[in-house]
Each structure stands twice: as C-alpha cells, then as structure tokens.
C-alpha cells in the first residue's frame, strides 16, 4: 500500500524553541516514522533536519539546528515505513517572523506598601532576540488575591515598582513581554503572588519636585515628621531597560547625603545630559523608610525651563507685558527647544487678590487696570507637551506704577 | 565586561587633522556616556568632552573651536577629531565611560600622539 | 575652571606602610571628587567616587576622606600593587579637571 503524506504540518516557534507538529494521513498505518528536510533561500539541496529524522510521534524538536533566524527556509516531510510517501512541502518561512516571545521569568520583592518586580527574558541569550534584548518591554496584570480585581499596567521595564499598595496584602500578578518594534506580544508568564509586608513605622518621603534656581537643581520634597536625615540617590533612567547591566547601581548625590532639611540643592553641571531617576529615604538614626517614589529628571529640559525675563511698558489701564528668553550666567539667552505658555500672575501692591493670565504669545496685554496704581507682574513658563509637562519656577516680582488717566492710547 | 581600546595615527605634523578610534565591546555605546581625556607628557590630564547615548555631546571650552566627538552605533564605536595640531597636542589620549556624572569608570589603554614637524 | 592641587608630588614607602595622599580644591567641590591609580603603560583605575564611597572591587584598604576644598586618599598595609601614580578629579563643574598627581614608590 501506497503510504500518504502527512498533511497539515505545524511550525511553532517560541523564543529558541523551534517545535513541529503534523497530522498522520492514514491512522490505519501502524509503526510509520517522519523525517524532515530544508533547504536554505538560494540553495538547491535539500539537507536532513537534524533532531527530525525517523520520528515515531508527530511532533520533533529542531532547536539545535543553527539558523539564521532573519534567513527563509523551507521544510518537507515525508512518511516511512518499507517504502516511503512522496514529499509534502511546508509552506516557506522566517524563523523571526515567526517565533512568538515566551512568557518571562519574574521575581518579586515586597515592601510594606509597594511591590519591586525584575523581569527577564524566559531564553537567557537567546538567539532570536539577540538584537532585540534592549527593546523588550513588558505589560502585566495584578490583581488583589482576595478580590480578583484586575489592573493592567503597560509600557514597563524590566525593572519597575508598583506604589500605593496595601501593608500586609497578598497580591498576583503575570507579566508578558512585546517587542513593539516587530509587532510581536508574547505570552504570560505564570501567575506569581507575593504578601506585602507590615506597614513600616516610618513613611517614605513624597512629593519630589525638581526646579531649577541660579544655575543649581532644588530637590524639595514632604515628609511626615520632624528631626530626620535623607539621603537622596541617583540612577541613569535608561538602565531600568536594561536587566543585565552590571553598571545597574543607584548612587548618592553628595550634596545631597544625610541632609536635615526637606530640600536639596546641587550644582546642573553635575550630571551629563539625560534623563535620571531620582529617590528619597528618610531616617531617624534608628530606623530607615523604604524608599519614595521614583521621579524622572530629564536635564536638558530641567535646565532649560529657567523662568522667563519680561519687560513691562506701562499705560494709564493696562500693562504690555513683552516676554524674552531666559539669561543663563554670561548673560546670554537660552534657547528654548520646546514650544511654551506662560503664565502671568498679577495683583495690586497693596491687595492680596490674584489675578492670571495663560497666553501663547510672547507679548501680552494686561487689561482692566486703574491708572497710578502699582501692580506687581511675575511669570513662569510651562512646556505644551503633554509627555514632557514640566513647568519653570516664578520669576522674580516686578511692579510698575500705571500712568495717569489719559495714556491709554 | 566593558573594554575600550583607541586607535590612531601615532604621528601627525603640526596643521594637521587628528582622528582617533575608540572602540567598545561588552557594552553598548547606545547607554551610558563616552568621552576622552587626554595626558601630556608631564602628566598632566585634560578632560577634552563626550557624546552621550543619545548622541547629545560636550565639549571642554578650551578646545571648542578645533573638536569634534562623533560615534556610529553600528559599529559600537565613536570618535575624535582635532583640528589644527600643534606640538602642544602631543600627548597620550584616552576614551572613557562615565555614567551621569563626570568620573570615569571604565578607560582605554590610551593611544599616543606625537605632533612634529 | 576649578585648579586641583594634590601633594606630594612623589612619595616612597615600604610594603605594610599607610600612606596619605592629599588634594586641595581652589574652590569648595561638595564632595564631588575621584579617586584614579594608574600603573607604568596602563589606564587609569578609578578607586573612589564622592569622596568616600569605594568602587565595586577596589580593596577596603583604601579610603577617601574630606569636605569642603580639602580631600585625601589613605592606603593602609600598602600592597606591593599598590605602587604607581594616584590622581584626584573634580566632578563638581564642568570641564572636571585633575590634580597633577603623585607618584608612589617603593622605598
């Protein structure tokens, strides 16, 4: 009897696992083996698939054959017993086009009211992935154990910390990984739940703000109590991408090591330009917070975003307020990069009462004023860009005195 | 593990345009920030700037007017160029990581550049 | 640019011995100072980073110390590698800029 090709054969490609799967054509058939062939683009000669000869199943394992992954290649099957079934030829493919990403490996670690999460890749060096380790980035779903509420958190590192949990709660979560660049997701890892831990007597600091004043950054952030020390510590944001860079250390800022206030302040020209993350801990000599929140600190905005310079010209009801570059030290304007809007307070001398203006324009009429009084005017800038959203410190207060009645023309 | 290796003429004449290679492997130059420094032959060390993962770059006052810092990913590597050398440019000139701030984590062997007529 | 002073320019000492070696800033750097060894025909090694804090690997018998515009390095037991040129570096402003060096030799 003549024997029948196998039919409907399957590729599955997960990381560097590269597994086949096939239909028998005749079931009635006993003791039949498989064996595969491939052939490369542009070679003629079939060669024998190795770990895919003589196979009692249907399904084999062709891991170990050394592709290019980016190459195309065509595989055939065939069925053997006494004599052989004529070739079926499994449609051409590229390994990478193919492959879909394993699910990754996870560890956590809790703290009382935050959950640090590492995340790898499932294939440690694989070879699918080889040019693609840095743009992995992860998704995950986390759900209280006792309530089964789920939460999706997008677009993480392989590195990331979720805040504002609850102390002594265990909760689950799984992670999967995509390469956005490939349009590829993979799949979940296994589910991993942890407990967090008893609420720490002291809180971490919150509320870290970055801004810029006479060529330093002041790092302000809020605390709870009194008479404590903090330290605040610094780490390149492109790290947090990157799993296996043994540069991944958070370091101090001098100036910023052991500070009895709830500010800091250290030189721009410390940090070469980039984006950081910041953090803060407090302690009482006895005990130690967990750390705050992380804060990005992106230089080249921080330093740019200086308050902006404005001239007043006076008239009996209103002021024209034209707005300049910035001054950084030497006198000379910085350029701004990104588009801004400015932000006009003005109020009278002798009021409390505030009044402000949002414009676009860097020459803004301030109207409905009474003539020989004095209003005082300061103003800062913020960054349209949504992603960005960072805003300058007020400028200083000047205050002009209106003109008499008549000068409004 | 991070390793920087530079490369160069050896010897130039004064007016002339100097080109070093540095060369990393074990890291990508597309983190961190990668810069040069030189040491003159009485020992004396002078930061010349960097380029940063993002190609964003610095350079020291001193030398504005006659340097150049830039880097091609795909070859892993990124460069110097000097303009108008004079004997007061010969020296042993080293690249180097840095990480944020300006110290020096990871340097080359360094390379030596002799200027003379 | 800030001017690093470091002193002695060259010192010699036995095996066993603690040495200090000193920097003095003309402007105070917060502490914002490193640490570099370098041996005949090699690259320098950065041993010290914030004035004090050890880099991953460097042996516990070094230390760094200091505030203000004044800095040191202290070598306790010295090493028979411990032997060669120790700079200091500023990285409180820009350009960061390096002592003139000390030279240790064996006594």
């Known amino acids: 009897k003549n024997l029948k090709s196998p039919q409907k054969v399957e590729v599955d490609i997960i990381d560097d696992n590269f597994i086949l799967r096939w239909n028998r054509s005749d079931e009635s058939v006993g003791n039949v083996t498989f064996s595969f062939d491939y052939q490369k683009t542009g070679m003629d000669n079939w060669i024998k698939l190795s770990g895919c000869q003589n196979i009692t199943s249907t399904k084999c394992n062709f891991s170990s054959l050394k592709l290019n992954v980016y190459e195309e290649i065509k595989l055939r099957i065939r069925a053997e017993k006494e004599n052989t079934s004529s070739w079926y030829e499994v449609d051409s493919f590229t390994p990478f086009r193919k492959a879909q990403i394993g699910p990754p490996e996870v560890h956590l670690e809790a703290e009382d009211k935050a959950i640090v999460i590492h995340i790898s890749p499932g294939t440690k060096d694989s070879v699918m992935w080889a040019l693609d380790g840095l743009s992995f980035t992860y998704s995950l779903v986390i759900w209280k154990n006792s309530s089964g509420v789920e939460e999706r958190i997008e677009n993480i590192y392989s590195r990331h910390k979720i805040y504002k949990l609850s102390p002594e709660t265990t909760y689950c979560l799984k992670v999967k990984a995509a390469l956005l660049t490939s349009w590829k997701i993979g799949v979940y890892s296994p589910v991993h739940c942890i407990k967090t831990t008893v609420e720490n007597e002291l809180p971490p600091p919150e509320n870290i703000e970055v801004s810029v004043q006479n060529q330093n950054y002041v790092l302000k952030w809020d605390y709870t109590y009194a008479n404590m020390t903090f330290q605040v510590q610094w780490l390149h944001a492109f790290l947090k991408r990157n799993p296996g860079n043994h540069l991944y250390k958070w370091k101090q800022i001098p100036d910023c090591e052991n500070v009895k206030t709830t500010q800091c302040v250290f030189p721009q020209n410390v940090f070469q330009k980039g984006i950081y993350l910041l953090r803060v801990q407090a302690s009482d000599g006895n005990n130690t917070s967990f750390w705050s929140e992380e804060i990005k600190f992106d230089t080249e905005i921080q330093a740019f975003l200086l308050p902006p310079v404005f001239n007043i010209r006076s008239l009996s009801d209103s002021f024209h307020i034209y707005i300049g570059a910035p001054k950084q030290s030497g006198n000379t304007p910085v350029i701004q990069d990104y588009p801004l809007i400015y932000e006009i307070i003005f109020w009278e001398n002798t009021s409390n009462a505030e009044r402000k203006i949002i414009e676009k324009k860097t020459d803004v009429t301030v109207p409905n004023l009474k003539p020989l009084t004095v209003y005082c005017v300061k103003a800062r800038a913020h960054t349209m860009d949504e992603k960005l959203n960072k805003s300058s410190v007020f400028s200083d207060a000047v205050c002009e005195k209106t003109k008499p009645g008549n000068t409004s023309k | 593990e991070v390793q920087l290796q530079e490369s160069g003429p050896g010897l130039a004449k004064p007016s002339q345009t100097l080109s070093l290679t540095c060369s990393v492997t074990?890291?990508?130059?597309?983190?961190?920030?990668w810069n040069w420094i030189r040491k003159f032959p009485g020992n004396k060390l002078e930061y010349m700037g960097y380029?940063?993962?993002?190609?964003?770059?610095y350079y020291n006052p001193s030398l504005k007017s006659r340097i150049s810092i830039t880097r091609a990913t795909s070859k892993n590597q990124y460069y110097l160029q000097l303009n108008s050398v004079t004997n007061e440019d010969t020296a042993t000139y080293y690249c180097?990581?840095?990480?944020?701030?300006?110290?020096?984590?990871?340097w080359g062997q360094g390379t030596t550049l002799t200027v003379s007529s | 640019d800030i001017q690093m002073t470091q002193s002695p320019a060259s010192l010699s000492a036995s095996v066993g011995e603690t040495v200090t070696i000193t920097c003095r800033a003309s402007g105070n750097i917060h502490n914002y100072l490193a640490w570099y060894q370098q041996k005949q025909g090699k690259s320098p090694q950065l041993l010290v980073y914030n004035a004090k804090t050890l880099e991953d690997g460097v042996p516990s018998r070094f230390s760094g110390s200091g505030s203000g515009t004044q800095y040191s390095l202290k070598i306790n037991s010295l090493q028979p590698e411990d032997f060669g040129s120790y700079y200091c570096q500023h990285f409180w402003s820009i350009p960061p800029t390096f002592g003139s060096g000390t030279k240790l030799e064996i006594k």
């Open positions: 074990g890291y990508s130059i597309t983190s961190d920030y």
């Open positions: 180097a990581r840095s990480g944020g701030m300006y110290y020096f984590d990871y």
């Open positions: 380029i940063s993962y993002s190609g964003s770059i």
